[in-house]
C-alpha cells in the first residue's frame, strides 16, 4: 500500500487537517483541569490523573492506552519533622530559622498535600558550621575559591545561588570541595526581572518563594536502585549505599528573604568580582563564617527527608501505523509536578492532550499515519527522569530496532518571546521547513511565518539568516532516547528574550506559585503561544510518522561534525607544546568527518533519485536514515558515564542541562594543565580522538550503498 492509499486523503491535506483541528481554547481547558491540585510523583493524586488521561486518550480514539508501573526510589520530606536551617549562637540556641513552607497563593490556602520546599534525595543530617558563599557553585566558581582565593570549603556549609547550571552539579561540586552541607537559594538577580511585580501581581518570584528540585547525579541511570534495568516486580535492587547518584551531604533550598538573613552576616573574604554579587542588600562576602560581632554564630541544617521505593505510573497510548506499524514515532512529556505544575509540566501535558485529540479526530475519519505513533505521559520526571527511563529500559530492544524519533513535550512555555528548539541535526531541515509553513503568533509579525519571527528574534550565532537551534543536553525525558539509545530526538517550546532577561529559567519555576493563573494572566492569556508549540510539536510528529521518506537530512550532520571538530581542535590547540610532545593529532578525525561529508552527499543524491514506489528500496533507505543516529552510539559509553553513549553529544559534565559536542574528547581536555600525570592525561585525549574518529567513520559507512 502506498502512503496515500493508507491515508485516504492527500498528505498535504492530512497535515492541514491535523493542524487546523488544534485549538487554543482546548489547551487552556486542559491546562486548567491538570493544575487544580498537586500531582507529585508517587502520590494518589498523580495516579488518579494517570487514569483520567488514559480514559480520555481512549475516548479521543487511540487504538490502545495502557498504564505501565514501576517501583522506584523517590524522596519526600518527613511530615512530622520538617526541614529547616537555623543560625545558632554560641550556646546552641536557634536565633533564626528559615520558613517551613511557602505562603500559598490566594485561592489555594485550603489545598492539601502541597509538599514544602525540599531538595529531593538529600540525605538526613544536622550539620553545623561556618558558611561559605560559593556563587553558583559551578566548577569555575570552586576553581576561583580554591585556587585563586585559597579558601577551603572542607567542613563548611556552603550557600549557593540557583541558576546557570543544574542543581545536581552544584551539589556534586560542593561534595568534592569537602562541604558538609549545601544551602541553595534564589537570588533576585537571577529570579526577579526588573520592572515586573512579584506573584500574584506579576510573574516574579516573591521573597518567600522557593525552587524545589532533585539533586541527583544519575548520569542517565534512571532509578538509582536498578541502573540499566526496569524497576519491575522481579528487579534486583541495590542497597542504598550502592545506589547511583545520591548526594552524600544534606541539601536544602530557601527563598531570598531567608537567604538575606544568612548572607547579611557574612564576613571573611570579599567577593572576587561583580559576577559574584547578586541583588540582595548584603555584602556578598565569601566567608568562611560570619563577620566580627557574629563570628561565634554558626549555621545548622535540620534535614529529615526520607527516600523510599514508591510506585509510579506512565500512560502509553498507541496509534497504529497503516504501512509501517513496526516503526515508532514517540511524543512524550511528563505528568508529575512539584506542586500545581502550571508551567512545568502541565503546559506541555495540555499540548500533548490536544495533539492526541487531533490525531484521534483524523483516525475517526478513517485516516491512519504511515508509522505507529506512541504517546507517553511520563511519571517521576522531577525525581530524575525515572518514568521515561524505566519504560525505555523495559522496551530497549524494541526501541533500538524500531525507534524512528522522539519528540519531547515538557513545559510549552518558559517565556513568550520566541521559539526555542533543541534537536538532532537530522531534524534541522524538518524544523525549518515546518516553521516556514506555520504562522507566527508574535506581535508585529502578523501574517508572517514562525520561521521569520524566530529568525529575527533568535538568529543563529554562526549562520546568518537562520534561527538558532541548540544541542540537546539533558534534564528532560528525551535523555534516555537520545543519549542512551541513539534515537533521533527534538524538543520545542516558547522562550524568553535571553538578551534582555538574565534570570535563569523562569522566576516561579518549581515553586508553589506556578499556577494556572500565572499562565493565564501573565504568560499567554490567549493561549496562542501554546497553540504554536502544539503546531510545532504536533507537526514534527505528523511529518515523522507520515512522510514517505523520513524527513531527516544527513548532510546537516556533516556540517555540524565539521564545526564540532574545528571547535574541539581549537580547544586542544591551547596546549600546542603538549600536543607536540605527546604527538596528539586530529588528522584522523578531520579525515573521518570529510569521509562522512562525502558519503552523506552521495547518499542524499541516491535518496533524491531512487524509485520511491519500490517498497523494499524505500524501507532500505529509510532504515539507513533511522539508524544513522544509532550509529553514533558507543556501546561502552563515555568514561564513568555508561548510560551516556552518544559520541557526538552528551550532557555537559559541569551542567546536566547543557549539551557538549565530542564530550569524550572535551572531558579529557578539561583542566588538563592541572592533571598530575600529563602523559596519562594526553594519552586519554588520544584515546578519545580515536573513539570519535572510529564512530564518525562507522556512522559514515552506514550511509554507503549497501551493496
Amino acid at each position: 500500500k502506498s502512503s496515500s492509499e493508507a491515508t485516504n486523503i492527500t498528505p498535504k491535506h492530512n497535515m492541514k487537517a491535523f493542524l487546523d483541528e488544534l485549538k487554543a481554547e482546548n489547551i487552556k481547558k486542559f491546562l486548567h483541569n491538570f493544575t487544580q491540585i498537586p500531582h507529585l510523583a508517587g502520590t494518589e493524586q498523580n495516579f488518579q490523573l494517570a487514569k483520567q488521561i488514559q480514559s480520555q486518550w481512549k475516548e479521543f480514539g487511540l487504538d490502545s492506552v495502557e498504564l505501565t508501573h514501576y517501583d522506584v526510589l523517590l524522596s519526600y520530606p518527613n511530615k512530622t519533622h520538617p526541614n529547616y536551617i537555623s543560625i545558632i549562637n554560641e550556646d546552641g540556641n536557634e536565633i533564626f530559622n528559615t520558613s517551613l513552607f511557602e505562603p500559598p497563593p490566594a485561592g489555594y490556602e485550603n489545598v492539601s498535600d502541597i509538599v514544602p520546599p525540599f531538595s529531593a534525595f538529600s540525605p538526613q543530617g544536622m550539620p553545623e558550621g561556618d558558611l561559605v558563599y560559593v556563587n553558583y557553585a559551578r566548577t569555575e566558581d570552586f576553581f576561583k575559591l580554591e585556587r585563586d582565593m585559597k579558601i577551603n570549603c572542607s567542613g563548611k556549609i556552603v550557600i549557593a545561588r540557583y541558576g546557570k547550571v543544574f542543581r545536581g552539579n552544584k551539589v556534586k561540586n560542593a561534595q568534592l570541595a569537602g562541604a558538609t552541607g549545601v544551602i541553595l537559594y534564589s537570588d533576585p538577580d537571577d529570579y526577579f526581572a526588573p520592572g515586573v511585580k512579584s506573584y500574584p501581581d506579576g510573574w516574579n518570584l516573591p521573597g518567600g518563594g522557593v525552587q524545589r528540585g532533585n539533586i541527583l547525579n544519575l548520569n542517565g541511570a534512571g532509578d538509582p536502585l536498578t541502573p540499566g534495568y526496569p524497576a519491575n516486580e522481579y528487579a534486583y535492587r541495590r542497597g542504598m549505599a550502592e545506589a547511583v547518584g545520591l548526594p552524600s551531604i544534606p541539601v536544602h533550598p530557601i527563598g531570598y528573604y531567608d537567604a538575606q538573613k544568612l548572607l547579611e552576616k557574612m564576613g571573611g573574604s570579599a567577593s572576587p568580582d561583580s559576577s559574584w554579587r547578586g541583588s540582595l542588600k548584603v555584602p556578598y562576602n565569601v566567608g568562611p563564617g560570619f563577620t566580627g560581632n557574629f563570628s561565634t554564630q554558626k549555621v545548622k541544617m535540620h534535614i529529615h527527608s526520607t527516600s523510599e521505593v514508591t510506585r509510579i505510573y506512565n500512560v502509553i497510548g498507541t496509534l497504529r501505523g497503516a504501512v509501517e506499524p513496526d516503526r515508532y514515532v514517540i511524543l512524550g512529556g511528563h505528568r508529575d509536578s512539584w506542586v500545581f505544575g502550571g508551567i512545568d509540566p502541565q503546559s506541555g501535558a495540555a499540548v500533548v492532550h490536544e495533539i492526541v485529540r487531533s490525531f484521534g479526530m483524523l483516525k475517526k475519519e478513517g485516516w491512519r499515519p504511515r508509522r505507529t505513533i506512541l504517546f507517553a505521559s511520563w511519571d517521576a520526571e522531577e525525581f530524575g527522569l525515572l518514568g521515561s527511563t524505566e519504560w525505555a529500559e523495559e522496551n530497549s530492544r524494541l526501541l533500538q530496532e524500531r525507534g524512528v524519533a522522539y519528540i519531547n513535550a515538557d513545559s510549552s512555555i518558559e517565556g513568550n518571546y520566541t521559539l526555542r528548539v533543541d534537536c538532532t541535526p537530522l531534524m534541522y531541515s524538518l524544523v525549518y521547513n515546518l516553521t516556514k509553513e506555520l504562522e507566527s503568533p508574535d506581535e508585529g509579525f502578523e501574517g508572517k511565518s514562525l520561521y521569520e519571527s524566530w529568525t529575527k528574534k533568535s538568529p543563529s550565532p554562526e549562520f546568518s539568516g537562520m534561527p538558532r537551534i541548540s544541542k540537546l543536553g539533558s534534564g528532560n525525558d528525551f535523555e534516555v532516547f537520545f543519549q542512551r539509545l541513539g534515537i533521533a530526538s527534538g524538543r520545542a517550546r516558547y522562550t524568553k528574550n535571553w538578551e534582555t532577561n538574565k534570570f535563569s529559567s523562569y522566576p516561579l519555576y518549581h515553586s508553589v506559585y506556578e499556577t494556572y493563573e500565572l499562565v493565564e494572566k501573565f504568560y499567554d492569556p490567549m493561549f496562542k503561544y501554546h497553540l504554536t508549540v502544539a503546531q510545532v510539536r504536533g507537526g514534527m510528529v505528523f511529518e515523522l510518522a507520515n512522510s514517505v521518506v523520513l524527513p531527516f537530512d544527513c548532510r546537516d550532520y556533516a556540517v555540524v561534525l565539521r564545526k564540532y571538530a574545528d571547535k574541539i581542535y581549537n580547544i586542544s590547540m591551547k596546549h600546542p607544546q603538549e600536543m607536540k610532545t605527546y604527538s596528539v593529532s586530529f588528522d584522523s578525525l578531520f579525515s573521518a568527518v570529510k569521509n562522512f561529508t562525502e558519503i552523506a552527499s552521495k547518499f542524499s543524491e541516491r535518496l533524491r533519485d531512487f524509485d520511491k514506489s519500490n517498497p523494499i528500496l524505500l524501507r532500505m533507505m529509510n532504515d539507513q536514515l533511522m539508524f544513522l543516529e544509532r550509529a553514533f552510539i558507543d556501546p561502552l559509553g563515555l568514561p564513568d558515564r555508561p548510560f551516556y553513549r552518544h559520541v557526538i553529544y552528551a550532557p555537559s559534565s559541569h551542567n546536566k542541562y547543557a549539551g557538549e559536542s565530542f564530550p569524550g574528547i572535551y572531558d579529557a581536555l578539561f583542566d588538563i594543565e592541572s592533571k598530575v600525570d600529563p602523559s596519562q592525561a594526553w594519552g586519554e585525549v588520544k584515546r578519545q580522538i580515536s573513539i570519535a574518529t572510529f564512530t564518525v567513520q562507522a556512522a559514515a559507512e552506514t550511509l554507503s550503498e549497501v551493496a
Partner: antibody
Framework: EVQLVESGGGLVQPGGSLRLSCAAS????????MSWVRQAPGKGLEWVSA????????YYADSVKGRFTISRDNSKNTLWLQMNSLRAEDTAVYYC??????????????WGQGTLVTVSS | QSVLTQPPSVSAAPGQKVTISCSGS????????VSWYQQLPGTAPKLLIY???KRPSGIPDRFSGSKSGTSATLGITGLQTGDEADYYC???????????FGTGTKVTVLG
Amino acid sequence: EVQLVESGGGLVQPGGSLRLSCAASGFTFSSYAMSWVRQAPGKGLEWVSAISGGIGSTYYADSVKGRFTISRDNSKNTLWLQMNSLRAEDTAVYYCAKDGVGATPYYFDYWGQGTLVTVSS
Amino acid sequence: QSVLTQPPSVSAAPGQKVTISCSGSSSNIGNNYVSWYQQLPGTAPKLLIYDNNKRPSGIPDRFSGSKSGTSATLGITGLQTGDEADYYCGTWDSSLSAYVFGTGTKVTVLG
C-alpha cells in the same frame, strides 16, 4: 557535464548594492556546498562566502561579514550573493565555485567563468 | 592579507622541475586538506590537486602535491610552456571557520 554560469555583475557606486546569481547544472545541486571567490584586478584569489548543502549554513570572510549575504534555492539550482554597502575594494571578478566533497567547503572542483563587479563613483 | 604564504614567482626552463611551497599554520594546513589551483591568463581557476596529493581526472601526473606539518608543496615536472600560469594553494582554516587561499605564485617557463 557540470556547468556554473554567473550573472549580475556591473558598475555600481560606493555604498550601493548588487545581486549576483549563479545558475548550476549537471550535478545534484542541493548536496554540495557552494562558494563565491573573488579576484581583484591583478591580485590573487580571495574566498568570500560559502553555503552548505542541506539546510544551507553560511560562512563569510571577515572582509564581507555583515555586508554580503549568500543564499541558494535548491529547487531552482541557483546560488546568489547579495552585496550591500559596496566599497571600492570590492571591485573584482566574482567566481561561483562548487565543492568537490559535499555539504561543507573542502576544495573547488568546478568554477564558473566569473562576473565583473566594479565599484566606482 | 592571506594566511597562506607562497613565493611570488618561480621559473625554470622547459622540461625542468619546479616546486611551489605553501606555508600556513596548524589551524589550516596543519589539520586540513590542501588543494592547488591553476589559473591560466584570462581564465577561471582550475582544480589541479585535492586532498593534499590527489589529481582529478584529466590532470597529468607531471603535477604532484605533498603536505608535511604546516606546509604543502606543489611539484611540476617536465615543465611545458602551457604551464605558465598563476598557482594557488587553498585550505579550510579551523580557527577562522573560513576557506583561505595562498598569496599565489607565478610560474614562468624560460627561453
